[in-house]
C-alpha cells in the first residue's frame, strides 16, 4: 500500500465545541435545502478500496475540492455559519498541505473524481448537498487524521 506522510491533524483541532457545533449547524441549514436525499457524496463509494492509512489523504482531497469549488463560490449563503466555518476548514486544509502519498494514488483520485463529477452534474444542488454533508466531512477528517 502507498505510504502517506504528514497526514495528521492535532486532536486540538477537533476539541473546540463552538466550531464543531457551527459546522453541524451549517450542514443542517444546507441539508434542509437539499431535496436529493438518495445521493450521498461522503459515503460507502468514496471509501471503497481505500485503506485507513490512506484515508486522511483521501479526505484532504475532498476537503480541498469542497473549499475551492463549493464553499468559496457559495460563501455569501447560509450565514452566519459560513463565515465562521470556512476559515476553520481552510486552516485544516493548510495544516494538511504537506500530506502526500508516496506511490500510486490512482484509486484514491478515482473515488474523489466520482464525487466531483456528482457535484458538477447536480449543479447548484450538488454544491448545496456538499455543504449539507460538511458534518460528514468534519467527522471523516477526525476519524482518519488524528
Amino acid at each position: 500500500a502507498p505510504i502517506s506522510s504528514h497526514c495528521r491533524l492535532d486532536k486540538s483541532n477537533f476539541q473546540q465545541p463552538y466550531i464543531t457545533n457551527r459546522t453541524f449547524m451549517l450542514a443542517k441549514e444546507a441539508s434542509l435545502a437539499d431535496n436529493n436525499t438518495d445521493v450521498r457524496l461522503i459515503g460507502e463509494k468514496l471509501f471503497h478500496g481505500v485503506s485507513m492509512s490512506e484515508r486522511c489523504y483521501l479526505m484532504k482531497q475532498v476537503l480541498n475540492f469542497t473549499l475551492e469549488e463549493v464553499l468559496f463560490p457559495q460563501s455569501d449563503r447560509f450565514q452566519p455559519y459560513m463565515q465562521e466555518v470556512v476559515p476553520f476548514l481552510a486552516r485544516l486544509s493548510n495544516r494538511l498541505s504537506t500530506c502526500h502519498i508516496e506511490g500510486d494514488d490512482l484509486h484514491i483520485q478515482r473515488n474523489v473524481q466520482k464525487l466531483k463529477d456528482t457535484v458538477k452534474k447536480l449543479g447548484e444542488s450538488g454544491e448545496i448537498k456538499a455543504i449539507g454533508e460538511l458534518d460528514l466531512l468534519f467527522m471523516s477528517l477526525r476519524n482518519a487524521c488524528i
Epitope: K28, N143, I146
Partner: antibody, heavy 121, light 110 residues
Amino acid sequence: EVQLVESGGGVVRPGGSLRLSCAASGFTFDDYGMNWVRQAPGKGLEWVSGVNWNGGTRDYAASVKGRFTISRDNAKNSLYLQMNSLRAEDTALYYCARGWYSGSPWSLGHWGRGTLVTVSS
Amino acid sequence: QAVLTQPSSVSGSPGQSVTISCTGASGDVGAYNFVSWYQQHPGKTPKLIIYDVNKRPSGVSNRFSGSKSGNTASLTISRLQAEDESDYYCSSYTSRYTTEFGGGTKVTVL
C-alpha cells in the same frame, strides 16, 4: 464472516472494576472504528464508548466518562473496555459493535452476542 | 432520558404500513446525516436495518425505508408482516462526538 466475541463480564461489587474484551475476526480490524453499547435488563440500547481505527480518538457517554476507558490492540484484533468505580446502574449486557462500513463507525452493522455485567452488593 | 424521542409503540395489521418517528433537538442531532435504525427481537442481538439515513444493508428487506425532514427522522415498514413485530431503535451521531439512541418503539402486528 465478521465475528465479534465479548468476554470478561461477571458479578462485581459497587466500586469494583472489570475489564471487558472483544475478539474480532473475519475482517481487517484496523480499518474500522469500534464501539461498546450496553442494554440494561428490559431497557433500551445505550451507547457507552467508541474508538477510531488507530486509537487516536476515544469518546464516551456522559454517564461513564472518567470511569471507563476504551482501548484497542490492532496487533491482537482486540477491543477492550476497562470499567472502574462500577455502580448498580452499570448492570447491563455489554455489546461490542463495528461500523457497517469503514467510513461510518456510527452505523453499527455488526454486533457480538454480549457479555453480562452485574453490579451488586 | 433518551435524547432522541420515539413513540413507545405503534401497531398495524398485516399488509399495512407503519411509520416510526425519531425526533431530536437540532444541536444534538445536527443534520441527521448520521441516522441509523436497528431492529431487535426479544432476547436477540440488534440488527442494523437502515444506515446513512436511508440506505439498506445487503440482505435487509426493501419493505424498510428511512427518511428525514427537519429534526425528525422516520422509519417506514411497508406491507407489514408478522416477523416485523419487534423493538426498533433510531440512533444518531452528535456534534459532541457521542452516539445517541432513541428510547425504542415496540411494533405490534395486529
